[in-house]
Interface confidence: low
């Protein structure tokens, strides 16, 4: 059988243990929230909150300002002082639950776990390229707030998500908070609310619209708000919550809640279940469920997508897509399949599904038994009736009440399970050129920057590196500042270039020059780097061929050997067609004539493995000596490929020219019918790639080949006679005169 080059794993062309050092800031405590600001006049800032403190950093991550946000009741608390003389509530540490920018002012708003979850507004004051915070305003009016009705109680100690939207001259805060019975009873924050910031910054306008988990469900039904964002005409919240009010509260699923960003009211509040699955390709699964469910959203981000992914998702380039990282459950149990999967939900498609769900509920014909849902927020009812009512009254509209869309939006893992054991804890998606890149933080403190693409069976890494030595999980929230992303891990904030931290993790010239253009990688003689790292020899133009192996390792001094060379950068063309005169192979002093590719033997190579094969016919020159020598491949004048051209020489030791010697043949006679087992003994009988034992010119079928012995079965003889017996290796006769005698059967 033909020898084939061993596959080289795709992973062998990169090293993810390469250390990259990126700029960082030590916050002095576990980072609880982080947000960035970029102004119109080139001023920018990073705001980092830890327990009882808010840091202001410049774009270089150097500290500009620091503000004490707690403990409440402590005379040193700078934000507390803005609320006038106290006491304002029970003393205690301030954990930052909300840190958002109000772009209209511009101002930073921070809300903490202390002081009934009130917020503080900090006007931004540009100072050169940096930003300072003005004295904080306390967004709390004592005479407006009661434990049972508190427009200024925003943050829940269990977690709150806020998106700020400008409507006309006003700033509206879209707020979603996790509640339980204890939190709800204490200056009751609401589950979902839309609050208008008062013009005098004394708090939020009373009489705001809100939805809250009904008191009877507060104990058993908890909603975690994972992410919120504003795009187009809507604000969206992403939740993880029990799939049912009545069933097992530990059976969770993920929902998207949609609110109008143009009308500050909740009548058109809609929810849609997001269903993310892993459908393994190991076998054709007959499973009707369509794959393994990953019901729990861990992190999410929405972004416009590049051309390639847009095509795969059947949407237009630049359209907004919601990306989510999903896991099997809160505890991650003894699961199977990858730990994390990534699903993509095009926003336009989400909106269409929601609108279709409203039609199903509100338009005739009425679908009997179709529930309005959201029974944890409102009284149960069937469509098209409003909550708690048996029928629709003439002056109410079915559409003006919250609704859970009856169908879910199902997608499968973009990465086909290839994230494997990786536990993703942070996600930010960017578009670079026409490429969509997922920047992911992991449980063990690594950053993976991977192209989002569906059709592959391997991951296309921009980078995969460790943020530091602590190995602490990367936190959920990621911020962008210019061409960098800010990730938090433990008490540190790290600044990671969107284009990747460098190129040194690409180990081969071919992998280096195939890297995305935006990475700016080039080859520096023996390493991959950016131009600033090796200005002298840096080039993005060509790669030498690379020999890794050849077969066989020996050949006859007389006669030909079919030599197979293995390696990379031989062709740069999938068909492996070689233009005339571009490839020269020499073995010792002897040329090896390139052989055309046998198209019948071409087999698809999965891109996660790579190897190229090149075959040539070696006919040693008369001057060639017996013994070890080198194999050399030189490629010149190759037309350029998509990424680079091949140019250069590669040399590999380990080929030996040998002279086969035939010492003995037995038996020397046998029946005319054939079938005698001949044993030929000698030295170097297995060299090269072809050998034949000829009995009277007819081939004796080889049964076994070793260095010192050949076994073959004689062919039938024409007559009883002594006939010549010879051995050819590589088409050349091995010296010696032997005869075989055919006898009567």
């Amino acid at each position: 059988e033909d020898w084939q080059c061993p596959r080289t794993p795709y992973a062998a062309s990169r090293d993810f243990d390469v250390k990259y050092v990126v700029p960082s800031f030590s916050a002095g405590g576990l980072v609880q929230a982080m947000v960035t600001y970029e102004g119109d006049r080139n001023e920018s800032a990073v705001f980092v909150a830890i327990r009882n403190r808010l840091h202001v950093l410049g774009p270089d991550l150097k500290s500009v300002q620091s503000l004490a946000t707690g403990p409440a009741g402590d005379p040193g608390c700078q934000t507390c002082a803005a609320c006038g003389p106290g006491p304002h509530g029970p003393p205690g540490d301030t954990d930052t639950k909300v840190l958002v920018l109000d772009p209209a002012l511009p101002a930073l708003v921070s809300c903490g776990s202390s002081l009934q979850g009130r917020c503080f507004l900090h006007d931004l004051e540009p100072q050169g390229t940096a930003v300072h915070l003005a004295a904080p305003a306390c967004l709390f009016s004592a005479h407006h707030n009661r434990p049972d009705d508190c427009p200024d109680c925003v943050a829940s100690p269990l977690g709150t998500r806020v998106t700020v939207v400008e409507q006309g001259q006003a700033s509206y805060f879209y707020v979603a908070s996790s509640l339980d019975a204890a939190v709800a009873a204490s200056f009751s924050p609401r589950s979902v609310s839309i609050r208008r910031l008062k013009a005098d910054a004394s708090g939020f306008a009373p009489g705001f619209v809100a939805l809250s988990v009904l008191p009877k469900h507060l104990v058993s039904y908890s909603i975690e708000y994972v992410h919120s964002f504003h795009t187009g005409a809507f604000v969206y919240f992403l939740t993880v919550q029990p799939a049912s009010v009545t069933d097992d509260p530990s059976a969770l699923h993920t929902r998207l809640a949609r609110l109008s960003a143009t009308e500050p009211e909740l009548g058109d509040y809609r929810e849609l279940v997001l269903d993310c699955r892993f459908a393994p390709k190991r076998r054709r699964r007959g499973a009707p469920e369509g794959g393994q469910p990953y019901p729990v959203l861990r992190v999410a981000h929405s972004a416009p997508v590049g051309a390639q992914l847009a095509t795969e998702l059947s949407i237009a380039e630049g359209q907004e897509v919601l990306f989510g990282v999903f896991v099997t459950g809160k505890d991650g149990g003894p699961g199977v399949g990858p730990n994390s999967v990534v699903c993509a939900f095009p926003i336009d498609l989400l909106d269409t599904l929601i609108d279709e769900g409203v039609e199903r509920c509100c338009e005739s014909p009425v679908h009997p038994g179709l529930r309005r849902g959201l029974d944890f927020f409102q009284s149960p009812s069937f469509c098209p009736n409003p909550p708690g009512l048996e029928a629709l009254s003439p002056n109410t509209s079915c559409r003006h009440f919250p609704l859970l869309v009856s169908s879910s939006f199902s997608r499968v893992d973009l990465f086909n399970g290839l994230l494997g054991p990786v536990q993703v804890t942070a996600l930010y998606v960017t578009r670079l050129d026409n490429v969509t890149v997922a920047h992911m933080g992991t449980m063990d403190g690594r950053i993976l920057q991977v192209e989002l693409v569906r059709s592959l069976n391997y991951l296309l890494y921009v980078s995969n590196f460790s943020l530091g030595d602590s190995g602490q999980p990367v936190q959920r929230d990621v911020s962008r500042l210019g061409d960098h992303l800010l990730f938090a891990s433990g008490d540190q904030v790290f600044q990671v270039p969107i284009q990747g931290p460098g190129c040194r993790h690409f180990l081969t010239c071919g992998r280096c020059l195939r890297a995305w253009h935006f990475m700016g990688c080039g080859w520096c003689g023996n390493m991959c780097g950016q131009q600033k790292e090796c200005p002298g020899s840096w080039q993005q133009d060509h790669c030498p061929p690379k020999l890794t192996e050849f077969h066989p390792h020996s050949g006859p001094l007389r006669g030909s050997t079919r030599l197979t060379l293995c390696g990379s950068n031989f062709y740069l063309h999938p068909s492996g067609l070689v233009p005339e005169g571009t490839h020269q192979v020499t073995v010792g002093q002897s040329p090896c004539r390139p052989l055309p590719k046998d198209s019948s033997k071409l087999r698809p190579v999965p891109r996660k493995d790579f190897v190229e094969e090149f075959e040539c016919e070696l006919e040693p020159l008369g001057t060639q000596a017996v013994g070890p020598t080198n194999v050399s491949l030189t490629v010149t004048n190759m037309p350029p490929g998509k990424h680079f051209r091949v140019d250069g020489t590669s040399v590999l030791r380990g080929f030996s020219f040998m002279e086969p010697v035939l010492i003995a043949v037995q038996p020397l006679f046998g029946p005319r019918a054939g079938g005698t087992c001949l044993t030929l003994e000698g030295q170097s009988l297995s060299v090269g790639t072809s050998r034949a034992v000829l009995v009277n010119g007819t081939e004796c079928l080889l049964a076994r080949v070793s260095e010192g012995q050949l076994l073959c079965a004689t062919p039938p003889g024409a007559t009883v006679a002594s006939v010549p017996l010879s051995l050819q290796v590589g088409g050349a006769q091995v010296p010696g005169s032997w005869t075989f005698q055919y006898r009567e059967d």
Partner: antibody, heavy 123, light 108 residues
């Protein structure tokens, strides 16, 4: 091609020990829970043991509990069954098997089986 | 433990016959039931999973039905290659699964 290949069977005296191996190829072994099933000569099938994909969870039939240990090495794509204190009634062909999918409803429907390895316990 | 019984324990039939094998569980197992075919000296082969779902590559003459405690494997038109033993298996009490004792289908 998806394949499971058992080895390690043979003749052993009562009270003796044997270690069976099952080499997996053609699929991402580390994602799949695995089981051992045995079949005594001329008899039906009997489930022996189960191991989760990570190796963290194991279960045994009452008839082998305390004597047999199931384990796996995901880096080597190999499943093991360490059999101690063997008895005559443990004589059987031992199969390793891999399930159809991930849902509970199909997670113990075995669509991939090895060819089996014979274990004979006799003095 | 959930006990599984099968009937008949063996049957003789001719090519082209319609054959039904029943499997009974000692308690309700919903549709957590699978059927296997086994030929002498070979490993079992999955035919039906989740009571009625046909495994990839299995001829459509095989079908499964039932829920709760009573299940049936039907071979619509027996072919020469179908002469074998058939086992049911419950996965309701997984991972402590149990198999039925088997039904041998022989040539009449």
């Amino acid at each position: 091609e998806v394949q499971l290949l058992e080895s390690g069977g043979g003749l052993v005296q009562p009270g003796g020990s044997l270690r069976l191996s099952c080499a997996a190829s053609g699929f991402t072994f580390s994602w799949y829970r695995m089981t051992w099933v045995r079949q005594a000569p001329g008899k039906g099938l009997e489930w022996v043991s189960y191991i989760s994909s990570s190796g963290g969870w194991t279960h045994y039939a009452d008839s082998v509990k305390g004597r047999f240990t199931i384990s796996r090495d995901n880096s080597k794509n190999t499943l093991y069954l360490q059999m101690n204190s063997l008895r005559a009634e443990d004589t059987a062909v031992y199969y390793c098997a891999s399930p159809l999918g991930f849902y509970e409803r199909v997670a113990y429907a075995f669509d991939i089986w090895g060819q089996g390895t014979m274990v004979t316990v006799s003095s | 433990d959930i006990q599984m019984t099968q009937s008949p324990s063996s049957l003789s039939a001719s090519v082209g016959d319609r054959v039904a094998i029943t499997c009974r569980a000692s308690q309700s197992i919903d549709t957590y039931l699978n059927w296997y075919q086994q030929k002498p000296g070979k490993a079992p082969k999955l035919l039906i999973y989740a009571a009625s779902k046909l495994e990839d590559g299995v001829p459509s003459r095989f079908s499964g039905s039932g829920t709760g405690t009573d299940f049936t494997l039907t071979i619509r038109s027996l072919q020469p290659e179908d002469f074998a033993s058939y086992f049911c298996q419950q996965s309701y009490s997984s991972p402590g699964i149990t198999f039925g004792p088997g039904t041998k289908v022989e040539i009449k």
